[in-house]
């Protein structure tokens, strides 16, 4: 889980070693609780590569880092589909693929990733400040989207084309490493909770270090399935503008950030309120949770308004592996 947890400053019961130890053992459960509750939050990664041989040709790769089965993927450009964006391709794991110009070839790479070769020329070249968006619908996570703008000026000859290896490693790390750490952390958390069960807890105070730092809030694990929107980052490799990647931030990212609300209505907020949390600077694409599935014909407990750009879908569709283009 790449979302940072912001833990409130704790007022130690007394100075000295015992106070320091108390501080540490009480901060740790908060961190672990955050990790446990947000464990397994899926995200979408997007990779854009300009072909060195054909300067007007681009390869867009998108993947879903989550445990659910993917029921549909759409790729659009010019912004999110439905908000000025134009659909480039729609991929269904069983019923095949449709693609539209300037898309040349859309295909499944794995059960959770797709690639799209795009042809552009002159003014329609994707490098001209184009935003690409990938949407994944999966069961049971719901609908997720990642978007970002291609840098306007670039020299594709300056950097080698990226390889999928880092993404595959990230996937394995997510499955193996994070799962192991979280399992250990959750067990340790239970141990700590049992130890502190009969001890009076010190009073929590909000952090004074930053007036904008969101306060930590604990929320029940039963609510975790409807947890607050997380804005983790997704790795982007682009040879459109080598060596520099924009920071995705509500005030410095793509223009469509302006349409995003600064709160998630009727959804419990996690320890880091997403609207004011800077996103790590490794990529300019962000993954935004768009909703959760419910059982067929049912609404989930929260029925509050979804995001402006990303409406809140609800409904099951579990699919098997990709069967390729019909």
């Amino acid at each position: 889980m790449r979302t940072e947890a912001q833990v409130p400053a704790l007022q130690p019961p007394e100075p000295g070693l015992e106070g320091a130890m108390g501080h540490r053992t009480l901060v740790l459960p908060w961190v672990l609780l955050t990790l446990c509750v947000t464990a397994g939050t899926p995200e979408v990664w997007v990779q854009v590569r300009m072909e060195a041989t054909e300067l007007s040709s681009f390869t867009i790769r998108c993947g879903f880092l989550g445990s659910g089965s993917i029921s549909l993927v759409t790729v659009s450009w010019g912004g999110p589909n439905g908000a000025g964006g134009t659909t480039l391709a729609v991929l269904h794991p069983e019923r095949g693929i449709r693609q539209w110009a300037p898309a040349r070839q859309a295909r499944w790479e794995t059960q959770s990733s797709i690639s799209l070769i795009l042809e552009g020329s002159g003014a329609s070249s994707p490098c001209a400040n184009t935003t690409f968006c990938c949407k994944f619908a999966s069961f049971p996570e719901g609908s997720w989207e990642a978007c970002g703008s291609l840098p306007p000026s670039s020299d594709p000859g300056l950097s080698a084309p990226p390889t999928p290896a880092p993404i595959l490693r990230a996937d394995l790390a997510g499955i193996l490493g994070v799962s192991g750490v979280l399992l250990f952390g959750c067990v340790y958390l239970l141990h700590l909770l049992r130890r502190h069960k009969h001890r009076p807890a010190p009073r929590l105070q909000p952090s004074r270090t930053s007036p904008q730092a969101p306060r930590a809030r604990a929320w029940a694990p039963s609510q975790a399935s409807q947890a607050a929107l997380h804005v983790p980052y997704a790795t982007i490799n682009t040879s459109c503008r080598p060596a520099t990647l924009d920071t995705a931030h509500p005030h410095g990212g793509p223009s469509w950030w302006a349409s995003l609300p600064t709160h998630a209505a009727h959804r419990p907020q996690g320890p880091a309120a997403w609207a004011s949390t800077p996103i790590p600077a490794r990529g300019s694409f962000v993954s935004v949770e768009n909703g959760l599935y419910a059982q067929a014909g049912e609404r989930p407990p929260h029925t509050g308004p979804g995001l402006t750009l990303f409406p809140d879908p609800r409904g099951p569709r579990a699919m098997e592996g990709p069967l390729g283009v019909r």
């Epitope: 759409t74 439905g82 729609v90 269904h92 539209w100 979804g306 990303f310 099951p316």
Partner: antibody, heavy 120, light 110 residues
Amino acid sequence: QMQLVQSGAEVKKPGSSVKVSCKASGGTFSSYAISWVRQAPGQGLEWMGGIIPIFGTANYAQKFQGRVTITADESTSTAYMELSSLRSEDTAVYYCAREEVSSPYGMDVWGQGTTVTVSS
Amino acid sequence: QAVVTQEPSLTVSPGGTVTLTCGTSTGAVTSGHYPYWFQQKPGQAPKTLIYDTGNKHSWTPARFSGSLLGGKAALTLSGAQPEDEADYYCLLSYSGASWVFGGGTKLTVL
């Protein structure tokens, strides 16, 4: 097999709006695109737009852009088409259609149609 | 917006063969237009016969087939029956997942 049942006939005044519903039954709803097509009396078919309910975003024919709104409610497996600023030439039978076995955004199964009459 | 053209009307004898075509103002029709063919009888909703150029539905009679022919989408009816008398519409897909119907062909089985 999937069935699409549409709402009943409507009579509207020019300048008003109409909202036609299309309820799906007999299959899953979320990741199957639903399209709206209309047919004026004695005329051919005209595609208005479509939506993939799971994503909630719709795309529209240029002709209807800004005047039509297509939405979907997954909890009731129902799609809606709202047409505003009605004119007499909007008098038509409005159909919903959705994919079933074809690739995404297909039109395999059709609703029975809803007659909308615009008259002053 | 692209214009999709069809023959306004065609006549076929019972048991005969007829081919309906569908062209586009943007050039040649390709499999990337995902051609559809629909049958519509008076007072009824359209019925999908062919999707994605040549794929048939379970309810599509075997005598109907779809293909690409000389830069156009084609619907061929071999062994026409009286019940095949209807209007036939083709549908093509264009960039941005937009769709355009042809004007329709009135098929008479005489």
